[in-house]
Interface confidence: medium
């Protein structure tokens, strides 16, 4: 009977050994497969993320164009209506003027003394630019670049005054440190009575005779946003 | 020999016990890993679905804009050609007019007596609107809203007549019940000789002096859909 | 003791049998689950690939439109500025003219005798087309199709001459075989003094009175591509 037990025990050991080997192989296989799937999953995930990012960037860039078209088309249509219509109110800016926040701006490319620049704008039914907010400051700055440029602010008759009557005291200001200083050291006679944007956009007072560039501004009529009666 | 068998059996039991424990742990680990992968897969799938849906919506919305631009640009180009060209045929509507079924419509925002409205349209090489179908009725109604508005229909010289010569008897009609009634009870002298859209779109005859809004219509020439010879 | 060993052996065999069965079931389950995940993963991957492809195609198609708008809008704006401005230089083509290599072309849809066609172009500050290269020949041919069409070449005063003074002898030519032949056999009086594109694009001389289509050409001024200063 002992020999029979030994036989059974040997058989059991062998079966167990085979099962152990096959189970370990299967588990190892599953583990490898799981690892591959995991890696594949990670790669798929980052692929999805990249695709999402790329498409999103493409879409945003396209959207910017499309938004620009909406604005360009509106502006062109308005100019076309102005050409065709007889409305006395201007609801869009002339060609080569830039519309921003219901005002039209014209940026010179040559230089003039402040009084000349002021006169130029007045003859256009416009005025030298009046800066009323940080937002408008940034807009103008973006268009003029780092170039000395006259604005509609002066103190030729005493206190600082905006050309369109906007209150200076309570309004927006963006002077350079220690400006305005009404400096007399330039040797050109008198002080400095006219304000201009400097190369970093902040303001300085200077001799009004300097031949700086300038910006004209005119407000779009508030009265009627309806299309003119044809 | 028994004791040796017992020893072998104990060893086998121990090996088996260890293998069982380690296999169960590995299988449990794999099972957990599989569950995680499954969940991750589900999340990835729904993420992909959401991204597909979002991008598809974005794209559709962008496509709508783009289709609108195609139409706007075509219209603007045509208007520009009309301004520049000397073609006697009009192939597109002026700015601020609405094109519909090869006609151009202009909707007033102020009021005039019927004769003044009629004259206004004539000065535009147009005529007061002539409604020839239920479809056109709905189009005009949609644009004027619930406001009394003159059309090109009157009986000032006897029978009801459309201003462009369209036959009244055989044509489309949309009178309110019991209208037209040529009512004399208003005390303004005479009856009611001019037709207008009422607040529900159906027609009524009224005193021609009333200062109602009006709609001008002009047909796009059928002769040539080609751009005019420049 | 033997019977005890047999008992233990039976118990171990049973435990082992149960464990084998349950392990095989679990491993089989994991294997199936792994296979499913793998298949799902493959499907997700190809879905992602398809989505990437579809969206990329949509985006490219949209981008083409948007690029076309950029160009259309630039052209319209330029035409608008030309309408509004007094710049003597033309920096863009009129509406309904086609720009190509810094020239503007207008393709007639009706027919005229050569002299009438020549006069038409002159009234447009243009001239009948002058073909100076194989590239320009292909461009014009593409636009006119297989239709007899006058060009700005004639020998009414003796030698062959281009209307804008371009030298005929040294310049581009594209005559049909055995043309020009100044044929008198047509019975219309005289020979053939005016050149036209034939149905395959090559040139032929014909009676100048024939009512053929024509092409006008005008050069965009090289002097200034800048928009006119307002």
């Amino acid at each position: 009977q002992n020999s029979q037990l030994q036989e059974e025990l040997r058989g059991l050991r062998e079966t167990f050994s085979n099962f152990t080997a096959s189970t370990e192989a299967q588990v190892k296989g599953l583990s490898t497969q799981g690892g591959n799937v995991g890696r594949k999953m990670k790669s798929l995930e980052s692929q999805l993320e990249k695709q999402q990012k790329d498409l999103s960037e493409d879409h945003s860039s396209l959207l910017l164009h499309v938004k620009q078209f909406v604005s360009d088309l509106r502006s062109l249509s308005c100019q076309m209506a102005a050409l065709q219509g007889n409305g006395s109110e201007r609801t869009c800016c002339p060609v080569n003027w830039v519309e921003h926040e219901r005002s039209c701006y014209w940026f010179s490319r040559s230089g003039k003394a402040w009084a000349d620049a002021d006169n130029y704008c007045r003859l256009e039914d416009a005025h030298l630019v009046v800066v009323t907010s940080w937002e408008e400051q940034k807009f103008v700055q973006h268009h003029i670049g780092p170039v000395n440029t006259w604005m509609g602010l002066h103190d030729q008759n005493g206190p600082w005054k905006w050309v369109d009557g906007t209150d200076y005291e309570t309004g927006f200001k963006n002077w350079r440190p220690e400006q305005p200083d009404d400096w007399y050291g330039h040797g050109l006679g008198g002080g400095e009575d006219c304000a201009h944007f400097t190369d970093d956009g902040r303001w300085n007072d200077d001799v009004c005779q300097r031949p700086y560039r300038w910006v004209c501004e005119t407000e779009l009529d508030k009265a009627s946003q309806e299309p003119p009666l044809l | 020999q028994n004791s040796q068998l017992q020893e072998e059996l104990r060893g086998l039991r121990e090996t088996f016990s260890n293998f069982t424990a380690s296999t169960e742990a590995q299988v449990k680990g794999l099972s957990t890993q599989g569950g995680n992968v499954g969940r991750k897969m589900k999340s990835l799938e729904s993420q992909l679905e959401k991204q597909q849906k979002d991008l598809s919506e974005d794209h559709s919305s962008l496509l709508l804009h783009v289709k609108q631009f195609v139409s706007d640009l075509r219209s603007l180009s045509c208007q520009m050609a009309a301004l520049q060209g000397n073609g006697s045929e009009r192939t597109c509507c002026p700015v601020n007019w609405v094109e519909h079924e090869r006609s151009c419509y202009w909707f007033s925002r102020s009021g005039k007596a019927w004769a003044d409205a009629d004259n206004y349209c004539r000065l535009e090489d147009a005529h007061l609107v002539v409604v020839t179908s239920w479809e056109e009725q709905k189009f005009v109604q949609h644009h004027i809203g619930p406001v009394n508005t003159w059309m090109g229909l009157h009986d000032q010289n006897g029978p009801w007549k459309w201003v462009d010569g369209t036959d009244y008897e055989t044509g489309f009609k949309n009178w309110r019940p019991e209208q037209p009634d040529d009512w004399y009870g208003h005390g303004l002298g005479g009856g009611e000789d001019c037709a207008h859209f009422t607040d529900d779109g159906r027609w009524n005859d009224d005193v021609c002096q009333r200062p109602y809004r009006w709609v001008c219509e002009t047909e796009l020439d059928k002769a040539s859909q080609e751009p005019p010879l420049l | 003791q033997n019977s005890q060993l047999q008992e233990e052996l039976r118990g171990l065999r049973e435990t082992f049998s149960n464990f084998t069965a349950s392990t095989e079931a679990q491993v089989k389950g994991l294997s199936t689950q792994g296979g499913n995940v793998g298949r799902k993963m493959k499907s997700l991957e190809s879905q992602l690939e398809k989505q990437q492809k579809d969206l990329s195609e949509d985006h490219s198609s949209l981008l083409l439109h948007v690029k076309q708008f950029v160009s259309d809008l630039r052209s319209l704006s330029c035409q608008m500025a030309a309408l509004q401005g007094n710049g003597s230089e033309r920096t863009c083509c009129p509406v309904n003219w086609v720009e190509h290599e810094r020239s503007c072309y207008w393709f007639s849809r009706s027919g005229k005798a050569w002299a009438d066609a020549d006069n038409y172009c002159r009234l447009e500050d243009a001239h009948l087309v002058v073909v100076t290269s194989w590239e320009e020949q292909k461009f014009v041919q593409h636009h006119i199709g297989p239709v007899n069409t006058w060009m700005g070449l004639h020998d009414q005063n003796g030698p062959w001459k281009w209307v804008d003074g371009t030298d005929y002898e040294t310049g581009f030519k594209n005559w049909r075989p055995e043309q020009p032949d100044d044929w008198y056999g047509h019975g219309l009086g005289g020979g053939e003094d005016c050149a036209h594109f034939t149905d395959d694009g090559r040139w032929n001389d014909d009676v100048c009175q024939r009512p053929y289509r024509w092409v006008c050409e005008t050069e965009l001024d090289k002097a200034s591509q800048e928009p006119p200063l307002l």
Epitope: A82, N86, E89, L123, D125 | - | L83, Q84
Partner: antibody
Framework: DVQLQESGPGLVKPSQSLSLTCTVT?????????WNWIRQFPGNKLEWMGY???????RYNPSLKSRISITRDTSKNQFFLQLNSVTTEDTATYYC??????????????WGQGTSVTVSS | DIQMTQSPASLSVFVGEIVTITCRAS??????LAWYQQKQGKSPQLLVY???NLADGVPSRFTGSGSGTQFSLKINSLQSEDFGNYYC??????????FGGGTKLEIK
């Protein structure tokens, strides 16, 4: 090319109104610039009378302010001069002209050919 | 109003000579001045804008100069087609934008 053409009666009686039309071709008067009336007296002295701008605003010579009116009809691309209560002193050649805006300054760059008006009873 | 004084009122010169016409403003007008030429029976033609800039198509023998209150128009090597009347006009401040009295340039 831009062209301006004046038209109107050559003879006006004293105390009546003088009305002239300037027709512009080649440019829309609503697009830009200022559209002016200028007159030249028999001794060749030139006088700027006033303008109407592209946006419809007007400016007049103060010496004429009580008598002058400049209007327009944009559908016909025309602008008009009306001078009331005329006397023999208003006998002159009347010109319309466009004031152009260069980057550096201004000038009347396009003129009509002028129309002669005599005030006489 | 700003007064514009032109001198001389007339001058008679030979073809090929140099001519200078001056214009004085009653107050500072910076560079806001235009010059015009007018031939007998024709309308004035713009020669110079902003004191120194030649209008399109104007020959280079014409030169504008000056700023503030003193301005001049110089014609080098006078040609027969240059004879006629010359006027200055200011574009400064509030209207009126007055003209000078004119200079009659005759052939000798």
């Amino acid at each position: 090319d831009v062209q301006l053409q004046e038209s109107g009666p050559g003879l006006v009686k004293p105390s009546q109104s003088l009305s002239l039309t300037c027709t512009v071709t080649g440019y829309s008067i609503t697009s830009d610039y200022a559209w002016n009336w200028i007159r030249q007296f028999p001794g060749n002295k030139l006088e700027w009378m006033g303008y109407i701008s592209y946006s419809g605003s007007t400016r007049y010579n103060p010496s004429l302010k009580s008598r002058i009116s400049i209007t327009r009809d944009t559908s016909k691309n025309q602008f008009f001069l009306q001078l009331n209560s005329v006397t023999t002193e208003d006998t002159a050649t009347y010109y319309c002209a466009r004031r152009y805006r260069y980057d550096e300054g201004y000038g009347m760059d396009y003129w009509g050919q002028g129309t002669s008006v005599t005030v006489s009873s | 109003d700003i007064q514009m004084t032109q001198s001389p009122a007339s001058l008679s010169v030979f073809v090929g000579e140099i001519v200078t016409i001056t214009c004085r403003a009653s107050e500072n007008i910076y560079s806001n001045l235009a010059w015009y030429q007018q031939k007998q029976g024709k309308s004035p033609q713009l020669l110079v804008y902003a004191a120194t800039n030649l209008a399109d198509g104007v020959p280079s023998r014409f030169t504008g100069s000056g700023s503030g209150t003193q301005f001049s128009l110089k014609i080098n090597s006078l040609q027969s087609e240059d004879f006629g009347n010359y006027y200055c006009q200011h574009f400064w401040g509030t209207p009126p934008w007055t003209f000078g009295g004119g200079t009659k340039l005759e052939i000798k």
